[in-house]
């Protein structure tokens, strides 16, 4: 069974049929810093990628998990919740050969991993260690436990407008 449950992420995601909408790669941003996608009239901020009614931002700078969470929050977003196969494939297509923090943390009292919307992660986190309570994706095909204090890149996501 797959770990992904389309209804447990706290968001409403829409499946795109036909070609997936993408942000204009070559267009210049409008004065408000948004660029329109090629269909549906939805928009993502400049430097964010559109996929299935969501906007995603992959940083090139690195920071701790808490700083990453705060960075995403400041952009009106959250660290990414990777709980559908479609979203996983999309992120594997756009993540460089680096590690990226996502919105998955270990709850010691429960001895289980949860997404930051409190839904349970039903997969397996690799590289587990007593001091590794955060998770990354990107360098491998796995969800890897990581120290929350080490600096990694981050993936933020939010609803497209």
């Amino acid at each position: 069974p797959q770990i992904f449950n389309k209804s447990n992420d706290g968001f409403t995601t829409t499946r795109s049929y036909g070609t997936v909408s993408q942000i204009f790669g070559s267009s210049s941003p409008s004065p408000n810093g948004f660029i329109t996608t090629r269909s549906y009239g939805t928009v993502c901020p400049k430097d964010w990628e559109f996929y299935q009614a969501r906007c995603f931002f992959l940083s090139t700078s690195e920071s701790s998990w808490n700083e990453s969470r705060d960075f995403c929050k400041g952009k009106g977003s959250t660290l990414a919740i990777v709980n559908t196969p479609e979203k996983l494939k999309f992120l594997q297509d756009i993540t460089d050969a680096e590690k990226y923090f996502i919105g998955l943390i270990y709850h010691r009292e429960e001895k289980r991993w949860r997404w930051i919307n409190n839904s349970v992660f039903n997969g397996n986190v690799t590289n587990q260690n007593q001091n590794f309570n955060c998770a990354t994706i990107g360098l491998t095909k796995t969800f890897d436990a990581a120290s929350c204090d080490i600096s990694y890149r981050r993936i933020c996501e939010k609803n497209a407008k």
Partner: antibody, heavy 116, light 113 residues
Framework: QVQLVQSGAEVKKPGASVKVSCKAS????????LGWVRQAPGQGLEWMGD????????YYNENFKGRVTMTTDTSTSTAYMELRSLRSDDTAVYYC?????????WGQGTLVTVSS | DIVMTQSPDSLAVSLGERATINCKSS????????????LAWYQQKPGQPPKLLIY???TRESGVPDRFSGSGSGTDFTLTISSLQAEDVAVYYC?????????FGQGTKVEIK
Amino acid sequence: QVQLVQSGAEVKKPGASVKVSCKASGYGFNNYWLGWVRQAPGQGLEWMGDIYPGSGNTYYNENFKGRVTMTTDTSTSTAYMELRSLRSDDTAVYYCARGKESFAYWGQGTLVTVSS
Amino acid sequence: DIVMTQSPDSLAVSLGERATINCKSSQSLFNFSNRNNYLAWYQQKPGQPPKLLIYFASTRESGVPDRFSGSGSGTDFTLTISSLQAEDVAVYYCQQHFTTPYTFGQGTKVEIK
């Protein structure tokens, strides 16, 4: 919409090199892995490698023994695949394709014929 | 390298009937961490590039008709066309996207009986 447009057919002699281009449009070129896959006439598909344009990071199929180099020009959203020391069995259609592991968007293909 | 073996090599099916293509990998394609099988299916028509139908063994790509479905886990996988249409005549390839080098099956040609 997403488009990958490749350069035209090439005829090369054994031992020569070929450089195939793939111009991308309709998406953020820097942010997606781009792979190269070839198909010999009447044969199956063979993954050659991929590149992440934003950083230049590459992974190559070791079966090509250092004969292949993948590069990008982010200013023109164009990817290149150079294959050196060509042999007759390198005759194939060469495709660029967007994605890291499985590929939803493909170029139209470039036929490279190696013949003396 | 992981070897992908498809069967049969060719298949003739009547319009409206079910077509089934099998693919076997030389090692498991199951990812223990995210619990997905890294197996994709493509359709290729003459003179055209391949078209992605299925990835993660069973996730249909956007815009692909629901008569195409994928199943299987570990080393054994199946692509099913529930009701063959004339436009489904093509060569079908499986591909493992579990580890590099990513490898493809030899292809299965589907024709109308």
